[in-house]
Amino acid sequence: EWVKFAKPCREGEDNSKRNPIAKITSDYQATQKITYRISGVGIDQPPFGIFVVDKNTGDINITAIVDREETPSFLITCRALNAQGLDVEKPLILTVKILDINDNPPVFSQQIFMGEIEENSASNSLVMILNATDADEPNHLNSKIAFKIVSQEPAGTPMFLLSRNTGEVRTLTNSLDREQASSYRLVVSGADKDGEGLSTQCECNIKVKDVNDNFPMFRDSQYSARIEENILSSELLRFQVTDLDEEYTDNWLAVYFFTSGNEGNWFEIQTDPRTNEGILKVVKALDYEQLQSVKLSIAVKNKAEFHQSVISRYRVQSTPVTIQVINVREGIAFRPASKTFTVQKGISSKKLVDYILGTYQAIDEDTNKAASNVKYVMGRNDGGYLMIDSKTAEIKFVKNMNRDSTFIVNKTITAEVLAIDEYTGKTSTGTVYVRVPDFNDNCPTAVLEKDAVCSSSPSVVVSARTLNNRYTGPYTFALEDQPVKLPAVWSITTLNATSALLRAQEQIPPGVYHISLVLTDSQNNRCEMPRSLTLEVCQCDNRGICGTSYPTTSPGTRYGRPHSGR
């Protein structure tokens, strides 16, 4: 049976004066020689050599200063061996407890704690939680930390409360005002032994976050400006406001608006984000003849909503702005600034000369009537197609057009007309748009396979030829309607997509015949005028060769049928 004792040892001091700090004996010692052996941490495992045993007596001595924070207790395995070196007892685990001393100060997890809280926050609002640890024995006074605020900057009324035990930093009042102090620096101490022992300090930097608790206020009670009529202005006037909230934030940024007077939408107010000034802009020209002065009322708020602590106190306060409109001799102008004319359908592009489009007169802006004492001239006139009468402002074509003209864009030609005030020399410009129809000047042509046919079998192949590939086959061939009183002499029969057979339906006398042919493409595009085909019908010999020509005057040129003109 083991007989044992072990004294606790205090860390950080020389316990050897109290040796033996433990003793082990086996009751077998009474009858035989026993050798004692110990092992474990502090003996034959690191930290080595703290405890030694007297092999003969079982006295255990401590030889070194111990650190409870490194080893809170030592478990010593004890053995009793007989003369043969065999165990006479079951190994014994002896515990040597190390008593704590207050040799460790509190340690803050950060040297500087950062926190933030909105101004006007309710009292007792949590700002941050400080964290500190103490390496001394847990749940003992040596490691029980008490926190306190040592100092506050800016000094004055204490604004924060620090929980002694939890390290919570809370607001002491609801009167935090960023506009008075935008940040606070607290020096905090943490002391163990519940505030009576070793202490350490840390710093808390608390940012007071801005809320929109200040209204923007105009620096002046009223504003005025003058502007000439008919002009725009990117900066007619600047309004200064004062807002105590944090600069360049939405709580500070001003939003200007009209409360009255801008019903005509002549003005806009833009905020200069650098200075927070309101810039009054004229975005729609004013007319002195209609309005000699404008009485505006303006107000200001912030981009951000007002904070709930002040929103009930907000009233829209209108500030008067008077704008004096200055009369300007206005002169002449085209009203509207552009005019569109349309060329009547069916007009040939070759018959445009002297075609009158209409008139486009300038008006006197002071009277709103047609301007007198003006001279009209063409301005930009690409292709030189148009001309304007210098007195009447009548516009007409002076040149025919090619339907492929590069000046026709989207079936429109564009030109400018100028009205010159003969008194002041001032010029006003109007834009003329002329919508032109499709001129089918390049429609397909019909080509006869041969110029002459025998009167005995008067037939010939007609082929369609396109010049610019604008027309796409297949083509429909038709003869132009003849006067009802005349019987039909010629007929036409389609052979394929681009050709047809023209033949006389009865025997006809020799002569030169003019036949009118209408060609239509697959998109139903047709020539403006029918194509006129000239065909000679002659008396042929038995080899099918034309005989002696007939006199050209008699029987004369024939149109479809001898002796008949159209």
Partner: antibody, heavy 121, light 112 residues
Framework: QVQLVQSGADVKKPGASVKVSCTAS????????LHWVRQAPGQGLEWMGV????????SYAQKFQGRLTMTRDTSTSTFYMELSSLRSEDTAVYYC??????????????WGQGTLVTVSS | DIVMTQTPLSSPVTLGQPASISCRSS???????????LSWLQQRPGQPPRLLIY???NRFSGVPDRFSGSGAGTDFTLKISRVEAEDVGVYYC?????????FGQGTKLEIK
């Protein structure tokens, strides 16, 4: 591969001190205990002591108590053995040896090449 | 201190023949953790010691399998099944159960 490289041979006068170094390669410096063993000319091996590289604690054989100091420098992975008050019977080859087990540290598996220290007047 | 006693102190052996070295401790070498910290080391002439066997019977890496260890408590044996020329040297037993660690006085193995 573990390697222990010791400082070169040294000659000392009686009463002087000698400091032998042992540099360990590999990245397990703080894991394994380091022992010092000496061998007098023509004699057997004699264990001198052990050092824990992690905490620096030591255990010395009773014979060397008071004269022997073992230290280590973790930044250079080097161990030092200093023996003071030298006498002629301290003339020997001094070996450093590292354990192969990290926990008990009781098996001397890796040995330095040895440093001959001669104590002579 | 635990005293380690080796026998024989010298052992002349014929190449290819077996050899055996004994080691006895003054106390049991069984540690309280249950392990027996007895090692065998070989020291060839002019070289540092080399670990052969640890914890009675465990061969260290790179050691030929002709070396084997046995024993318990206080009596231990190192056997070489077939001696080779390179085996010449001094063999030591080492107890590491208790501080201070102690070596046997060594057994010199030589070829006949």
């Amino acid at each position: 591969q573990v390697q222990l490289v010791q400082s070169g041979a040294d000659v000392k006068k009686p009463g002087a001190s000698v400091k032998v170094s042992c540099t360990a390669s590999g990245n397990t410096f703080t894991t394994y205990s380091l022992h010092w063993v000496r061998q007098a000319p023509g004699q057997g091996l004699e264990w001198m002591g052990v050092i824990d590289p992690s905490g620096g604690s030591t255990s010395y054989a009773q014979k060397f108590q008071g004269r022997l100091t073992m230290t280590r420098d973790t930044s250079t992975s080097t161990f030092y053995m200093e023996l003071s008050s030298l006498r002629s019977e301290d003339t020997a080859v001094y070996y450093c040896a590292r354990s192969i087990e990290s926990i008990s540290g009781r098996t001397l598996g890796y040995w330095g090449q040895g440093t001959l220290v001669t104590v002579s007047s | 201190d635990i005293v380690m006693t080796q026998t024989p102190l010298s052992s002349p052996v014929t190449l290819g023949q077996p050899a055996s070295i004994s080691c006895r401790s003054s106390e049991t070498l069984v540690h309280s953790d249950g392990n027996t910290y007895l090692s065998w080391l070989q020291q060839r002439p002019g070289q540092p010691p080399r670990l052969l066997i640890y914890k009675i019977s465990n061969r260290f890496s790179g050691v030929p399998d002709r070396f084997s260890g046995s024993g318990a408590g206080t009596d231990f044996t190192l056997k070489i099944s077939r001696v080779e020329a390179e085996d010449v040297g001094v063999y030591y037993c080492l107890q590491a159960t208790e501080f201070p660690y102690t070596f046997g006085q060594g057994t010199k193995l030589e070829i006949k």
